[in-house]
Interface confidence: medium
């Protein structure tokens, strides 16, 4: 969880950012109530991007991917790293900067028609059921606006969960990622003891659905650590 990332004081009491005075209404529409933010740039942050711990690419920014900072480093220590530009080495799509994808270990432009064709084959079109959800991440490829609104059904190849239809998430299956169902109450889930440990899974499960959390099954409390069964349970 984020609790292990942010110390208890990091976001408890918000100081007026960059010299703005608390209690003075900002001029921008939808600005934070009571905060004036000089320059009006809603997306800037105060610090100089100290490394942000992560467990998966989707926890990083659009121009980042999640990996160990050192080659062959401890899989349990991962941070958000700057994406790889065109012609740089890669191991998966998310490592490449927006507008590129990973092909044969090299980041190449995704403008090429053959790549769009591959995506069109693997993502089921559902324009009548366009769920723009909280789950959303803009796709890292430069697809047409028509393509942007397609949502993959169960089993469709995906890059991230926003590629999948409502009720599905993008999870690893062997060495690719496909849309799988979000877990329901009572279903077995994976509780990761260490940050980044699910990088080792080749059959990754989705997370538990709304109002559920992944906890040890009641009758398994006495079992050994290695055999504890986790299921999605009501909070």
């Amino acid at each position: 969880t984020l609790n292990s990332v942010l110390n208890s004081n990091a976001i408890k009491n918000l100081p007026p950012p960059l010299g703005g005075a608390a209690g003075h209404p900002g001029s921008a529409v939808s600005a934070a109530p009571g905060i004036l933010y000089p320059g009006g740039n809603k997306y800037q942050t105060i610090d100089n991007y100290q490394p942000y711990p992560c467990a998966e690419d989707e926890e990083c920014g659009t121009d980042e991917y999640c990996a160990s900072p050192t080659r062959g480093g401890d899989a349990g220590v991962q941070i958000c790293l700057a994406c790889r530009k065109r012609r740089k080495r890669c191991m998966r799509h998310a490592m490449c900067c927006p507008g590129n994808y990973c092909k044969n270990g090299i980041c190449v432009s995704s403008d090429q028609n053959h790549f769009r064709g591959e995506i069109e084959e693997t993502i089921t079109e559902s324009f009548g059921n366009d769920h723009s959800t909280l789950d959303g991440y803009s796709r890292r490829t430069t697809l047409s606006s028509k393509m942007y609104h397609t949502k993959g059904q169960e089993g469709s190849v995906c890059l991230r969960s926003s590629d999948c239809a409502s009720g599905l998430c993008c999870a690893r299956h062997f060495w690719s990622k496909i849309c799988k169902p979000v877990l329901k109450e009572g279903q077995v889930c994976t509780k990761h003891r260490r940050k980044g440990s699910h990088g080792l899974e080749i059959f990754q499960r989705c997370y538990c659905g709304e109002g559920l959390s992944c906890r040890i099954q009641k009758d398994h409390h006495q079992a050994s650590n290695s055999s504890r069964l986790h299921t999605c349970q009501r909070h």
Epitope: Y52, A55, E56, S132, T133, L134, G136, S138
Partner: nanobody
Framework: EVQLVESGGGLVQPGGSLRLSCAAS????????MGWFRQAPGKEREFVAV???????NYADSVKGRFTISADNSKNTAYLQMNSLKPEDTAVYYC?????????????????????WGQGTLVTVSS
């Protein structure tokens, strides 16, 4: 732009519970984090809880163990379940949505200006 509408506020006795809801509309596909903040009369606004798209959560120390943040992606809705409420929890509660940035930093979640905001819902804890 994301539009956020909170509901569920009201008057509750100490020790009671409330569930706040936040319905998001507009460019919700760009949301990276959904958060709840609160502002008590005469005080600065403070962070309450945040949930990332992937489900990671963080809470202010003052609400840990009492409040639970969650999100239903299919309904574009975030929730704040508040249990064991105390008089000091009395405040206007704001729902907030932050877009996915190009680069993530620890301070991204603490910078109020990164969020779009709802109008707020009043929670009063009093006997």
């Amino acid at each position: 732009e994301v539009q956020l509408v909170e509901s569920g506020g009201g008057l509750v006795q100490p020790g009671g519970s409330l569930r706040l809801s936040c319905a998001a509309s507009g460019r919700t596909f760009s949301n990276f984090a959904m958060g709840w903040f609160r502002q008590a009369p005469g005080k600065e606004r403070e962070f309450v809880a945040v949930i990332l798209r992937g489900g990671s959560t963080n809470y202010a120390d003052s609400v840990k163990g009492r409040f639970t943040i969650s999100a239903d992606n299919s309904k574009n809705t975030a929730y704040l379940q508040m249990n064991s409420l105390k008089p000091e929890d009395t405040a206007v509660y704001y729902c907030a949505a932050a877009p996915r940035p190009k680069r993530v930093s620890v301070s991204y979640f603490s910078t109020a200006s990164n969020y779009d905001w709802g109008q707020g819902t009043l929670v009063t804890v009093s006997s």
